[in-house]
């Protein structure tokens, strides 16, 4: 079975997919599309690196650009480094500015929603 | 003004390849992905792939896969578009078009002016 | 990939006649379908894209409606300019797909 089908057959479980599934299918060629991926949990998107998302959504990716404005996108697009965001081509602005250094600091994050940042 | 500036008519052989090229101006270049399109005489519009500008990476339609290659130059804001083992089928005008991202994946608002390449014993 | 069936293929009518187009996919494209012009010799023109926004200096007499599988595209009124081929194209997935063209012609 080849990745595309292996999609297909687990598509309408995806919605509770926790990040160390997204991860592992980011490696097997699925080709997630727009619709299923803005169904995600926010929680489970935010910690994939561009570079995951790229090859979990492999073409699909191209529709980023229409959904920075929503969640997840907009979140996860908070969450990650402006030059990873700007090797996808597609002009996604308010990724973190390069330079900058980020804090894992749980409780910050959870009263502004946005990571904490240290200037250059 | 955004423009899309295509090279010239080719005439090839079967079996030999071409290399299409679209250079871009009037944008940043790297923020959207540069797609190709092809009519062939009296035909409608096939679309045979995309690339992003930014790292190069192309994605292209099942039906070309073996024999497409497309290829960017940052440095010179132009895309490239080679097609291999070329036949008499393979005549047809080549555009390159640049999507607008206003809603789902996007839709073509520029196109280059066109390339005919003709292939002919 | 989803397929787009367009008709007619192609259709003769008299200045000032309605002209309608059909496009139909072979699968759910939400609102996401453009349509072009193309005349001889000439690149794409587009018209109209999510189905019935019209883009900027096109005539209010090019319109276009549906959702889902079933789209429509019409002149209101066909004029000598309007003469060219038209297509439609569907961008609800990222491998696009247009649809086979309708010449129009004038009687």
């Known amino acids: 079975m080849n990745g595309s089908e292996y999609f297909v057959k687990i598509q309408s479980f995806l919605g509770g997919a926790p990040t160390e599934d997204l991860k592992a299918l980011s490696q097997q060629n699925v080709s997630m599309d727009l619709a299923t991926f803005m169904k995600l949990r926010t929680d489970a998107v935010l910690p994939l690196t561009v570079a995951e998302v790229q090859k979990l959504l492999g073409p699909h990716v191209e529709g980023l650009k229409a959904e920075e404005r929503h969640r997840p996108v907009r979140d996860w697009i908070l969450r990650q480094r402006q030059d990873d965001l700007d090797t996808l081509g597609l002009g996604l602005q308010g990724g973190i500015p390069n330079g900058y250094l980020v804090l894992d600091l749980s409780m910050q994050e959870a009263l502004s929603g946005t990571p904490c940042l240290l200037g250059p | 003004e955004v423009q899309l500036v295509q090279s010239g008519a080719e005439v090839k052989k079967p079996g030999a390849s071409v290399k299409v090229s679209c250079k871009a101006s009037?944008?940043?270049?790297?923020?959207?992905?540069m797609h190709w399109v092809r009519q062939a005489p009296g035909q409608g519009l096939e679309w045979m792939g995309n690339?992003?500008?930014?790292?190069?990476?192309?994605y292209y339609n099942e039906r070309f896969r073996s024999r497409v290659t497309m290829t960017v130059d940052k440095s010179t804001s132009t895309v490239y578009m080679e097609l291999s083992s070329l036949r008499s089928e393979d005549t047809a005008v080549y555009y390159c078009?640049?999507?607008?991202?206003?809603?789902?994946?996007?839709?073509?608002?520029?196109w280059g002016q066109g390339t005919t390449v003709t292939v002919s014993s | 990939d989803i397929q787009m069936t367009q008709s007619p293929s192609s259709l003769s009518a008299s200045v000032g006649d309605r002209v309608t187009i059909t496009c139909k996919a072979s699968?759910?494209?939400?609102?996401?379908i453009a349509w072009y012009q193309q005349k001889p010799g000439k690149a794409p023109k587009l018209l109209i894209h999510?189905?019935?926004e019209l883009q900027p200096g096109v005539p209010s007499r090019f319109s276009g409606s549906g959702s889902g599988t079933d789209f429509t595209f019409t002149i209101s009124s066909l004029q000598p300019e309007d003469i060219a081929t038209y297509y439609c194209?569907?961008?609800?997935?990222?491998?696009?797909?247009f649809g086979g063209g309708t010449k129009v012609e004038i009687k």
């Open positions: 999510y189905t019935s």
């Open positions: 699968q759910d494209i939400n609102k996401y």
């Open positions: 009037g944008y940043t270049f790297t923020n959207y992905w």
């Open positions: 078009a640049r999507p607008y991202y206003g809603s789902s994946y996007g839709y073509f608002d520029y």
């Open positions: 194209l569907q961008y609800a997935n990222p491998l696009r797909t």
């Open positions: 690339i992003n500008p930014s790292n190069g990476g192309p």
